[in-house]
Amino acid sequence: NWVNVISDLKKIEDLIQSMHIDATLYTESDVHPSCKVTAMKCFLLELQVISLESGDASIHDTVENLIILANNSLSSNGNVTESGCKECEELEEKNIKEFLQSFVHIVQMFINTS
């Protein structure tokens, strides 16, 4: 499932190249393993900002598919309470390109520990 999430992220990256979306998104670029579930939830919410601002059906569908995959993959450890992690609003705001790159990194963390 996480491997498919990466495929969707690559697809989103390709789709947004032809668009002008100047949104900045809360991005965790240095995820601590003990905060990865919290960080993932932030990434999943911020991803929907891209969908909200693009108005593009392909982006909507890809974002939604990614969220389905990620939430289902998260469900086994999504209820774990991680303490001492940053709230989404405390993260740095980055452009979409940097956001997607950091998103790929956190997904790889999940792949490596599954």
Epitope: T38, L44, I67
Partner: antibody
Framework: QVQLVQSGAEVKKPGASVKVSCKAS????????ISWVRQAPGQGLEWLGW????????KYAQKFQDRVTMTTDTSTSTAYMELRSLRSDDTAVYYC??????????????????WGQGTMVTVSS | QSVLTQPPSASGTPGQRVTISCSGS????????VYWYQQLPGTAPKLLIY???RRPSGVPDRFSGSKSGTSASLAISGLRSEDEADYYC???????????FGGGTKLTVLQ
């Protein structure tokens, strides 16, 4: 396109309960949340609470905590809001709205879009 | 209980620029985003501005949001008759974990 269709108008007696439904289409219902908001005649908007259709987590506004129950049925992509011990000042249009939050920590950065058409609930003896 | 204060009414003529304010207490608006919803007569509200100043796709750039200190504003330039509606600001109260709406502003477009 994303659409939320609500159940029809209700007339209830004081002390009774009402259950409003909100059927979603055009998106994966079980991956997101639903917020409920009401509007008394000629008044402003008031948030009642949120439910995650993904995991059933709920967060109710303090004011309604002991009278409201929100549920979802993912097999029919429908959200429900039940309000008990109705009083005349509960007379309002009740709206459901798609909320991007599937997890509680996402709620503080969420938004409500789109909204259902509203359900008029009249409480009168 | 946190409160967001909006003027009950505002008006302007077609083509004009109008501003609707939304003010909160010192502690709230400064560190929380403001959202704006438009409610046309007899219809459900619609998301207009989110996170202080961002527009969802499909919302004309005549609508803009801003925030300074404890006050947020919605500006509508090139006013049109179809902008006649109620406008609500909202924010998330992190202490209560609840969404709070302003009282709403009824915008009238004078012909």
């Amino acid at each position: 396109q994303v659409q939320l269709v609500q159940s029809g108008a209700e007339v209830k007696k004081p002390g009774a309960s009402v259950k409003v439904s909100c059927k979603a289409s055009g998106y994966s219902f079980s991956s997101f949340g639903i917020s409920w908001v009401r509007q008394a005649p000629g008044q402003g908007l008031e948030w009642l609470g949120w439910i995650s259709a993904f995991n059933g987590y709920t967060k109710y506004a303090q004011k309604f905590q002991d009278r409201v129950t929100m549920t979802t049925d993912t097999s029919t992509s429908t959200a429900y809001m039940e309000l008990r011990s109705l009083r005349s000042d509960d007379t309002a249009v009740y709206y459901c709205a798609r909320d991007p939050a599937a997890w509680p920590l996402q709620q503080s950065l969420a938004w409500f879009d789109p909204w259902g058409q509203g359900t008029m609930v009249t409480v009168s003896s | 209980q946190s409160v967001l204060t909006q003027p009950p009414s505002a008006s302007g003529t077609p083509g004009q620029r109008v501003t609707i304010s939304c003010s909160g207490s010192t502690s709230n608006l400064k560190r929380n985003y403001v959202y704006w919803y438009q409610q046309l007569p007899g219809t459900a509200p619609k998301l207009l501005i989110y996170r202080d100043r961002r527009r969802p796709s499909g919302v004309p750039d005549r609508f803009s949001g801003s925030k300074s200190g404890t006050s947020a504003s919605l500006a509508i330039s090139g006013l049109r008759s179809e902008d006649e509606a109620d406008y609500y600001c909202a924010w998330y109260d992190r202490e209560l974990s609840e969404w709070v709406f302003g009282g709403g502003t009824k915008l009238t477009v004078l012909q």
